[in-house]
Amino acid sequence: NIDVCKLGTVTVQPAPVIPLGSAANISCSLNPKQGCSHYPSSNELILLKFVNDVLVENLHGKKVHDHTGHSSTFQVTNLSLGMTLFVCKLNCSNSQKKPPVPVCGVEISVGVAPEPPQNISCVQEGENGTVACSWNSGKVTYLKTNYTLQLSGPNNLTCQKQCFSDNRQNCNRLDLGINLSPDLAESRFIVRVTAINDLGNSSSLPHTFTFLDIVIPLPPWDIRINFLNASGSRGTLQWEDEGQVVLNQLRYQPLNSTSWNMVNATNAKGKYDLRDLRPFTEYEFQISSKLHLSGGSWSNWSESLRTRTPEEEPVGILDIWYMKQDIDYDRQQISLFWKSLNPSEARGKILHYQVTLQEVTKKTTLQNTTRHTSWTRVIPRTGAWTASVSAANSKGASAPTHINIVDLCGTGLLAPHQVSAKSENMDNILVTWQPPKKADSAVREYIVEWRALQPGSITKFPPHWLRIPPDNMSALISENIKPYICYEIRVHALSESQGGCSSIRGDSKHKAPVSGPHITAITEKKERLFISWTHIPFPEQRGCILHYRIYWKERDSTAQPELCEIQYRRSQNSHPISSLQPRVTYVLWMTAVTAAGESPQGNEREFCPQGKAN
């Protein structure tokens, strides 16, 4: 709200723009008849320095010249790069209560002369684009700096454009707005950038180029693919390009891949045949273009075409396994299981599986289709049966996989020996074995099969299995292996028409069980006590139970209890003990032991044997 510079003037020597490190003299002069009323001698001029609108210094001590009451000159040094504001004020010393009155102010800019622009680079995007050049301006000047881009070429062609840099905008690129046409392909052009500000000027070295050097073709557009006869592996990629393009680069990859397939195509004219695609796979395709075989620049990659290749009939064979159980006096239930094909084998969406169960001698055949990966049928217990399964998609079916239905554990001579199961880490178990000792027929393959030792549905919880070649004697099982769960593991040795198996239990991690078995009854029979119990609930077992312990001691005794250790068998829920004295009251309880330790004790029961117990 002040009338700026009504009271006086402020001038700068040598100029309001100075190089870094220079000093300046600032003079503040009052206009005639201005100043403190009636007392000119009491006029005191002060100079205040502001940076970013913040008062940083009173330059009272920097006076180098003083005409009392009329003007003062101050020397300022060590000014930082950028702009600094100086304000001259009048202080009437006889009136202490009045604040100093602004007289006038000046801005001093400190900067550097521009460096010669470097690294000039020019491009024309597409045949119909315009020439644009960019450069490196060098160090910041802190001053308004004008840049002029000049182009000269054949036939007295000249053209120039200007822009400036200051503290709000940067000028390091200019579009000349002119188009270079292919008929000037061999001509040479020269560009130069000149920079100028209040402290000096500089010019770049001339930069020479040809049409081919700077024209970057537009990326190809309208990309599409046509699959020959709906093939999943062969397709023709088509696109639109600028007229002068002679070279294309194609890249394509399945969407989940990390490396591109690269192809160079000369004179493709917007068309290229691909022959190595994977059926029923999501692909991404991109194309780039170049105007000259040896010179020039590649265009940017085109926008991606994303598409899925068509299906082809499945290949590979299904991994089949089965379970067989007698369900009455002359019938058996066969449950067939198989693993889904991996995507490279399925080569499409599997719509259904074709299942065949055939009795070899009578030529009885049961056939069905299912969308599930299991199939169950009841068949006679007599006869030799074989099963086959194939997978079908919209283009066809895989070759059927055959398996002979044999009694999987029927031949003792084929049972593998020395089966062991060791926990490797939290989620796998290493199973090892030795081959059958006296097999009367050659082992064709081993199957390692495992199931959790907890209640499950036969069809909802199918088995897990691994096929192992006959010369291997170990398997690392990890599919569906969870810690603190006990698994029953079977190693099957299969010949052409027979099977033998051995079983073991194993876990990947174990803890001591949460509780001990619950004693349900104690009965006396033929001078022996029978202890009956219910097993620990499966979630509380926390691994494979190795054995149970039955403890007993005389009631109110402080002696250590006696104990009897029983090998754990799920089918067993009672055990005799025979070392208790008749007509003595005992307290009994049970615990369970895993490889990690013993559970807390289960419930306590008191019992007083009546007869002679020996």
Epitope: Q325, T370, H372, S374, W375, T376, R451, A452, L453, Q454, P455, G456, S457, I458, T459, K460, F461, Y487, E488, R490, S503, R505, R570, S571
Partner: nanobody, 119 residues
Framework: QVQLQESGGGLVQPGGSLRLSCTAS????????MYWYRQAPGKQREFVAY???????NYLDSVNGRFTISRDNAKNSVYLQMNSLKPEDTAVYYC?????????????WGQGTQVTVSS
């Protein structure tokens, strides 16, 4: 443990129909494969039909096309609809559930319901 309770048996004339029901209770969380068996006087118990967790069904040849097994998971029940009944269908019909633990199959049985086909 699993408990099974059958109902719906009775006396019916040849060509008639009956619908047997079986309701499961107890530890049924792992029971998905349900069966019907029958035992005629002086004969061994024989398989009649079963239904799996995925509603796949299978039948004894002599009842195929006349009997239909179905289930209602919400009611923990399995049913046997018996049509065109014949005198040779006379038997005690048992509901059965099979559960697998490791490689051991546990069988659970109902107490049976009598079906008599006679004129």
């Amino acid at each position: 443990q699993v408990q099974l309770q059958e109902s719906g048996g009775g006396l019916v004339q040849p060509g008639g129909s009956l619908r047997l029901s079986c309701t499961a209770s107890g530890s049924i969380f792992a029971i998905d494969d349900m069966y019907w068996y029958r035992q005629a006087p002086g004969k061994q118990r024989e398989f009649v039909a079963y239904i799996t967790a995925t509603n796949s069904a299978n039948y004894l040849d002599s009842v195929n096309g006349r009997f239909t097994i179905s289930r209602d998971n919400a009611k923990n029940s399995v049913y046997l609809q018996m049509n065109s009944l014949k005198p040779e269908d006379t038997a005690v019909y048992y509901c059965n559930a099979k559960q697998i633990v490791g490689f051991q199959i546990d069988d659970y049985w109902g107490q049976g319901t009598q079906v008599t086909v006679s004129s």
